[in-house]
């Protein structure tokens, strides 16, 4: 789950579960910073606007990131 805190990592727990790119409203990738030493990925789902913290090391999540970036590159002129 994500938690809104200013000087800490956002994610308290992370999920390995694959996410269907079509069910994604938004995908936030927060790079490492002075506040949090590792990358954080927060998915917002279309259904109910539910959010989920994703495990950047998970194979399923890496595949999701590839699929999303491919989709974006198709859309951009």
């Amino acid at each position: 789950i994500p938690l809104s805190r200013t000087v800490r990592c956002t994610c308290i727990s992370i999920s390995n579960q694959p996410v269907n790119p079509r069910s994604l409203e938004k995908l936030e990738i927060i790079p490492p910073s002075q506040f949090c030493p590792h990358v954080e990925i927060i998915a917002t789902m279309k259904k109910k606007g539910e959010k989920r913290c994703l495990n950047p090391e998970s194979k399923a999540i890496k595949n999701l990131l590839k699929a999303v970036s491919k989709e974006r590159s198709k859309r951009s002129p």
Partner: antibody, heavy 121, light 109 residues
Amino acid sequence: QVQLVESGGGVVQPGRSLRLSCAASGFTFSNCGMHWVRQAPGKGLEWVALIGFDGINEYYADSVKGRFTISRDNSKNTLYLQMNSLRAEDTAVYYCARDWPEGYYNGMDVWGQGTTVTVSS
Amino acid sequence: EIVLTQSPGTLSLSPGERATLSCRASQSVSSSYLAWYQQKPGQAPRLLIYGASSRATGIPDRFSGSGSGTDFTLTISRLEPEDFAVYYCQQYGSSPPFTFGPGTKVDIK
């Protein structure tokens, strides 16, 4: 199967220390935030502390802040609660609970059986 | 700090009856952040409802949650003998503490 087992409870004098442990099995412990929740005899549930999956984030109830420390060892699949300067009002059953990671907030979906701490002179 | 109030303190009902439990917050809680737990004597709590209205895995459909803002409700449509227990609501706001309500005891009339 998914399981949490607490240990380390006992009878201790006021002002002394105790360390509780919670052994996790059956799930990817290193992905999950973990909580300690306590229940005084005949009373309701009181949230005590939370630690993030990676040990970076720690949060405490005001009643234990500065006295209790939550920690974890992901290589041993174990959660800890170091309790210092214990008071009579810390007497309770202490539960560890898993923060369910599959959503923004899905509650504490797995609980241990609890370990009893009695603070008495 | 958000304070949760549960009512009634005790609910005396018979098996087969409908139970309606209330949880009120001192300030608005996002419905994503509200959960309900059941606890039987000598046992650990069990997650029933998360996100105010979603049933946890394995929870029978006679349990339902509703509400938003400051008022939330847990309904048990037809009480089974195993449903007599204490029920707690809990909020998980954008920052701790993650407070529990004082509980509602559902006992046999």
